[in-house]
């Protein structure tokens, strides 16, 4: 094939891949006709003038995870049809100087994974084509301004893992053609206002593992076509009131792991694409009226591990869509009977992990679609008569870890227990915690005859309207134990960032054990 | 007769971690919750977690990047690991359950306590 | 979390007299379905465990003297013990379980 070099591998598709440690420099001759090149994984250390002068058809040269910390500013001479180029997952600390020049028909360039310590505007001055240009993983502590104003034709520009501490609001001015932004896991504080005005076709903006503490309220109003935004993992700990209001098109946010305190009504939206919302581990204390009435389309609600201790009642107001709301791990100790009425299509809700003592009998009225409820270890003692008669698709249900009062007002949710057994899952049952001679015993099995008359707790409202025992049970004959699937944090959908996060059972949305983290 | 025994303590290096194990007889951890407490000499008492008899968890939220409480019911033995130890996580540790007690986070029986000293 | 501050810091009491400690907490520890404050009281003798003493304020927990009692309601309690014995010398904690619990600073009380 027109002379491959014995250390390479040559295709008849014009294909060349050299790798292996005893390569220590380019490769020659290499086959005129190439059109494909990549050295991978070799000891080479440096590129010097012109190695591939002899192969100009070139289109796509992959240098990738070698030992390259030097290049001769003429390296890549008479490479004019050459669209891509990578030089990622290599050891350069500097870029010489016009080493892209006479570089006219470059797409994509690849220069994530190094050391380098700084660009300067004239690196890219001669990559008027330009599409796609992956920085991350480098040493970078600043942008200068002007370093990607020659770059109008961009379209996706990843500057995350890099060192960048602030970002000047000029720097992407020019970039009116890009739809991905990525300034993840850098060391910003703040984002000076007008920073993104210029990025009127931006689709996603990843802003997460940073250490933005505040938002300015106009941050955003310039990129309506915005559909994916992450912002979890930093310091912001308010939202201001318009912040969010100019995004139509956003059907991605994430907020978690901030220090958001509240949220007021209002704030997300409108949104008429948002499935799911993302605001577990932050200090919320309480979920006012309509705070979410704007997200008419949103699935997925995931509000654990804040520190909600209320929530009013019309807090869900507009959630009409929502199938899956996460509560666990906060505070409540009460909730409104009418809180989740407006959730005709929840299947799944999770309430583990707070202090609930009791719950109104009709806190599931309207939400007959019900699949699985977390109620483990809260503070339950019992529950209210027929609260979960009407949920005949309810196949999982977590009771355990509660202080269950096995005197005679247990007993009807006891018998119905009986007869939902599979429901409860084989793993962990509910036991009494009182009276002390029955504590630890399986409320299930517990021996009626032990049970003692009801003390001094004030009575549970109930509803004997309700019927304990339906003359024929609604309920389906099922061992099944969940019909979720486990999230523990939304994946960033996109292959060159890894920040997916691991839990322990402590995780954020909770559904079972055996699927959590 | 009801019983719960701490070991594991001893000497630990800043930045180290600990595994304290809290032997149980007399009950079963699938029917009780055991409590881990703490308290630095001539100090007070400082709550750190619980696991419930169904293997749930809640932590002292200012340590609880630090904390795992885990347990194995067959060997009736319940386990604090902590990590990132610094001087002012010397103290001895407790565990407790709560036996007769109608108060749910009631510790109406405690271990005698195993000391941990934290010092380079 | 809630706080809870007891006062005073010790107390010297004859033998035979009443002894008062105060616990309050940073917000009420009330229930008002249940009707429970979730407030404990444990007692600490030099070189023992704690030993429980009274929950929910005001119940005492099965073979505790009746010279202890428990008062209080919402963010306000208090422990008597209304005729010192030379065995009460010890150091008493008040504990919410409102929400996690937490303990208060710890009162010790000596024979004067």
């Known amino acids: 094939y027109h002379g491959c070099p014995s250390e390479c591998t040559c295709s008849r598709a014009s294909q060349v891949e050299c790798t292996g440690a005893r390569i220590v420099a380019v490769p020659t001759p290499l086959p005129w006709n190439a059109m494909s090149l990549q050295i991978l994984n070799t000891h080479i250390t440096e590129l010097n003038e012109s190695p591939f002068l002899n192969i100009s058809a070139l289109i796509a040269l992959r240098i990738e995870k070698n030992e390259l910390s030097r290049i001769t500013p003429g390296a890549f001479r008479n490479l004019g049809s050459l669209r891509y180029l990578s030089l990622a997952n290599n050891k350069l600390q500097v870029l010489p100087i016009g080493l892209f020049q006479g570089l006219d028909s470059l797409e994509s360039l690849l220069l994530s994974s190094n050391q380098l310590l700084q660009i300067q505007p004239a690196h890219f001055s001669q990559c008027s084509n330009l599409k796609e240009l992956q920085l991350h993983g480098n040493h970078l502590e600043y942008i200068p301004d002007g370093a990607f104003d020659h770059l109008v034709g961009l379209t996706k520009l990843n500057l995350g893992k890099n060192s960048l501490t602030h970002i000047s609001p000029r720097v992407f001015q020019h970039l009116g053609n890009l739809q991905v932004l990525r300034l993840y896991e850098n060391r910003l504080t703040d984002i000076p206002m007008g920073t993104f005005d210029g990025l009127v076709n931006l689709q996603e903006l990843a802003l997460q593992q940073n250490q933005i503490g505040l938002l300015s309220p106009g941050l955003f109003h310039n990129n309506h076509n915005l559909q994916r935004l992450y912002l979890s993992n930093n310091h912001i700990s308010q939202l201001p009131p318009s912040v969010f209001m100019q995004l139509p098109q956003l059907n991605r946010l994430t907020l978690f792991g901030n220090s958001l305190k509240e949220l007021s009504p209002g704030i997300f939206g409108p949104m008429p694409n948002l499935r799911e919302l993302w605001l577990y581990d932050n200090h919320i204390s309480s979920l006012p009226d309509n705070v979410f009435s704007n997200l008419r389309q949103l699935q997925v609600l995931i509000l654990s591990r804040n520190q909600i201790s209320f929530i009013s009642p019309g807090a869900f107001n507009g959630l009409t869509e929502l199938r899956e709301l996460s509560l666990h791990t906060n505070a409540l100790q009460d909730l409104d009977g009418n809180v989740f009425r407006m959730l005709a299509n929840l299947q799944n809700i999770s309430l583990q992990n707070n202090r609930l003592r009791q719950l109104p009998g009709n806190i599931f009225a309207n939400v007959n679609g019900l699949m699985a409820i977390q109620l483990q270890n809260n503070q339950l003692e019992n529950l209210p008569l027929g609260i979960f008669d009407h949920l005949g698709k309810l196949c999982e249900l977590r009771l355990y870890d509660n202080p269950w009062r096995c005197d005679s007002d247990i007993l009807p949710l006891r018998n119905w227990l009986l007869l939902n057994q599979p429901r409860l899952g084989t793993d962990t049952v509910p036991v009494c915690f009182s009276p002390a001679n029955v504590r630890g015993q399986s409320l299930i099995i517990i021996n009626v005859n032990v049970a003692v008359p009801s003390v001094h707790v004030p009575e549970v409202p109930s509803y004997p309207e309700t019927p304990w025992y339906p003359d024929t049970p609604s309920y389906p004959d099922t061992t099944s134990v969940s019909s979720t699937t486990e999230l523990t944090s939304p994946v960033e959908d996109y292959t060159d960032l890894t920040t997916i996060q691991v839990t322990d059972d402590r995780s954020v949305w909770g559904m079972t054990q055996a699927q959590s983290g | 007769e009801v019983q719960l025994v701490e070991s594991g303590g001893g000497l630990v290096q800043p930045g180290g971690s600990l595994r304290l194990s809290c032997a149980v007889s007399?009950?079963?951890?699938?029917?009780?919750?055991v409590h881990w407490v703490r308290q630095a000499t001539g100090k007070g008492l400082e709550w750190l977690g619980v696991?419930?008899?169904?293997?749930?968890?809640n932590y002292n939220s200012a340590l609880m990047s630090r904390l795992t409480i885990s347990k194995e019911n067959a060997k009736s033995s319940v386990y604090l690991q902590m990590n990132s130890l610094r001087a002012g996580d010397t103290a001895m540790y407790y565990c407790a359950t709560h036996m007769i007690t109608e108060d749910y986070y009631g510790m109406d029986y405690w271990g005698q306590g195993t000391t941990v000293t934290v010092s380079s | 979390d809630i706080v809870m501050t007891q006062s005073p810091d010790s107390l010297a009491v004859s033998l035979g007299e009443r002894a008062t400690i105060n616990c309050k907490s940073s917000q009420s520890l009330l229930n008002s379905r249940t009707r429970h404050n979730y407030l404990a009281w444990y007692q600490q003798k030099p070189g023992q465990s704690p030993k429980l003493l009274i929950y929910?304020?005001?119940t005492r927990e099965s073979g505790v003297p009746d010279r202890f009692s428990g008062s209080g309601s919402g963010t306000d309690f208090t422990l008597t013990i209304s005729s010192l014995q030379a065995e009460d010398v010890a150091v008493y904690y008040c504990k919410q379980s409102y929400n996690l619990p937490t303990f208060g600073g710890g009162t010790k009380v000596e024979i004067k």
């Open positions: 696991i419930w008899a169904g293997g749930s968890t």
């Open positions: 929910w304020a005001s």
């Open positions: 007399g009950f079963s951890l699938t029917s009780y919750g």
